[in-house]
């Protein structure tokens, strides 16, 4: 559970946080779990512990393996394991999937690319960028703090991105680099002010009185995911959780695409054996999103039953 | 939401031990310490001691050692504080609380109702 | 053990009153807790690492302090915050309370 993988190049320095973390003021003890040695503390070893980080300056293909962090908290020790594996470095251009960090996606709105694990070095500005192997040029481009900045994202800007930068320690200068892969959202999203399609503003809906009735709350919120978007019935302005008659039920219906792209979404509203009480509530449904709340209000009238007498 | 339910109250001879429970629901059990802290009416609070669920690892002040006995059932998400030879100023409520995040110690975020165990003759 | 001294053990302030509690450690402790409690109930966390404020806590609490000495304060007493308050460290084992501050109002 509180095991990490970490991983790096050969010569190049590696510093791995411990997963447990702690109060700065915790002790933090390192062992290399195959042989439960002790890891130095001395700076001078090429290997060292430094509180909650283990550094490898540099790192060798021999330094892979377990690595166990014991914090010492004031009650109890507890105990995280680090993953450690260290690569040759390839030849090729090709970074293989194994040394690739997470994925991000970005759009002409947002396109930060973060440097992975940066924050665990003594670096300073500026990074170096690459995208496949190629040094990036150009006012597109923009190196600002941690992070990588695209101007105007296209689709052909998908790829894999690597990062180099210096560790500084003690005056003595490593090289990192890191790689992870950028993908374009090509789908431009939007959001507006909920627009209820049914039901209709004060609607009166024929029901038959024992029978069951279904009444469908469908609203859209524009195109795209929507951070927050949610339909639901009221029943006398209260929640129908809350407002305690079994009978009468909501349900989520299916995430609606229209053809046009907006994203809707459906709330069915299910009364069971429909009761003359019922003709007296006021049914509203609701749609609601960062922009604001439609209500449209809907009553129950009672539908005769077709006289089959001759 | 997290939530810790403890066992009713109790009254117990003094000699005897009585074992509250404490379910937790809400989060990943074997994630968190759980720590006891027990109240005398009218006093302030004290630190008896926690267990670790995924270990079963404890810790306890010292001055309860020997006394408090305290495990964790991890197919049910429950702790239990066990405490023996009970005496007359063993009568308190018995909190169980976790912290809110468990490896940085930010003070105890979540607590039980209490239960009142009462020693008397 | 690392002893913890609270003071006042009572006091009686006005609503709006600017209220300050001290706890005093008989040795060097890194962070300091402080929580509420009232009649019948568990207590409640209100400020955590000395200085920090628990979620859904009114920002009219606030804590301070370094070392041995700490400061609870409220900077407008409410009619709700009658209540016992308490400091707890978390440096050394055994994990200590202060004896608790009753605060009435007046």
């Known amino acids: 559970k509180f095991s990490k993988q970490s991983w790096g190049l050969e010569n190049e320095a590696l510093i791995v946080r411990c997963p447990r973390q702690g109060k700065p003021s915790y002790t933090v003890d390192w062992y290399y779990s195959q042989t439960n040695k002790s890891i130095p503390t001395q700076e001078r070893n090429r290997v060292f512990a430094s509180g909650q980080l283990l550094k490898f300056l540099p790192a060798a293909v021999a330094d892979s393996g377990i690595y166990t962090c014991i914090v010492r908290s004031p009650t109890f020790n507890r105990t995280g394991y680090a993953n450690v594996t260290i690569y040759k470095k390839q030849s090729d251009c090709n970074v293989p999937d194994y040394l690739m960090y997470s994925t991000v996606s970005g759009s002409e709105k947002n396109s930060k690319i973060y440097c992975p694990t940066i924050d665990l070095y003594n670096w300073t500005a500026p990074l170096e960028w690459f995208k496949n192997c190629q040094a990036l040029q150009g006012s597109r481009y923009r190196a600002h703090k941690s992070f990588l900045v695209i101007d105007n994202v296209m689709t052909e800007d998908a790829g894999d991105y690597t990062c180099k930068f210096i560790h500084n320690e003690n005056g003595a200068n490593y090289s990192v680099t890191a790689t992870r892969s950028f993908t374009v959202k090509d789908e431009q999203g939007f959001s507006l002010f909920p627009v209820i399609g049914a039901p209709a503003q004060n609607e009166i809906k024929e029901v038959e009185i024992g029978k069951n009735a279904n009444l469908t709350c469908s609203a859209c919120f524009g195109k795209g995911t929507q951070f927050l978007a949610a339909v639901l019935w009221q029943l006398n302005g209260t929640k129908i959780t809350d407002f305690g008659e079994p009978r009468i039920q909501q349900e989520e219906g299916q995430n609606q695409s229209f053809s046009n792209g907006l994203a809707c979404l459906d709330m069915v509203l299910r009364i069971a054996d429909v009761k003359e009480e019922d003709l007296l509530l006021q049914y509203d449904c609701l749609a609601l999103n960062l922009h604001g709340l439609r209500r449209h209000t809907v009553r129950l009238s009672r539908k005769n039953p077709i006289d089959h007498h001759s | 939401q997290v939530q810790l339910v403890q066992s009713g109250a109790e009254v117990k001879k003094p000699g005897a031990s009585v074992k509250v429970s404490c379910k937790a629901s809400?989060?990943?059990?074997?994630?968190?310490?759980m720590y006891w802290v027990r109240q005398a009416p009218g006093q302030g609070l004290e630190w008896m001691g926690a267990?670790?669920?995924?270990?079963?690892?404890?810790a306890f002040n010292q001055k309860f050692k020997g006394r408090v006995t305290m495990t964790a059932d991890k197919s049910t998400s429950t702790a239990y504080m066990e405490l023996s030879s009970l005496r007359s100023e063993d009568t308190a409520v018995y909190y169980c609380?976790?912290?809110?995040?468990?490896?940085?110690?930010?003070?105890?975020?979540?607590w039980g109702q209490g239960t009142m165990v009462t020693v008397s003759s | 053990d690392i002893q913890m001294t609270q003071s006042p053990s009572s006091l009686s302030a006005s609503v709006g009153d600017r209220v300050t509690i001290t706890c005093s450690a008989s040795?060097?402790?890194?962070?300091m807790h402080w929580y509420q409690q009232k009649p019948g109930k568990a207590p409640k966390r209100l400020i955590y690492d000395t200085s920090k404020l628990a979620s859904g806590v009114p920002s009219r609490f606030s804590g301070s302090g370094s070392g041995t000495d700490y400061t609870f304060t409220i900077s407008s007493l409410q009619p709700e915050d009658a209540a016992t308050y308490y400091c707890q460290q978390w440096s050394s084992n055994p994990l200590t309370f202060g004896q608790g501050t009753k605060l009435e109002i007046k």
């Open positions: 267990i670790d669920p995924e270990t079963g690892d404890t």
């Open positions: 609380t976790r912290a809110f995040d468990n490896d940085n110690d930010e003070g105890f975020a979540y």
């Open positions: 040795s060097s402790v890194n962070y």
């Open positions: 809400g989060y990943t059990f074997t994630d968190s310490e």
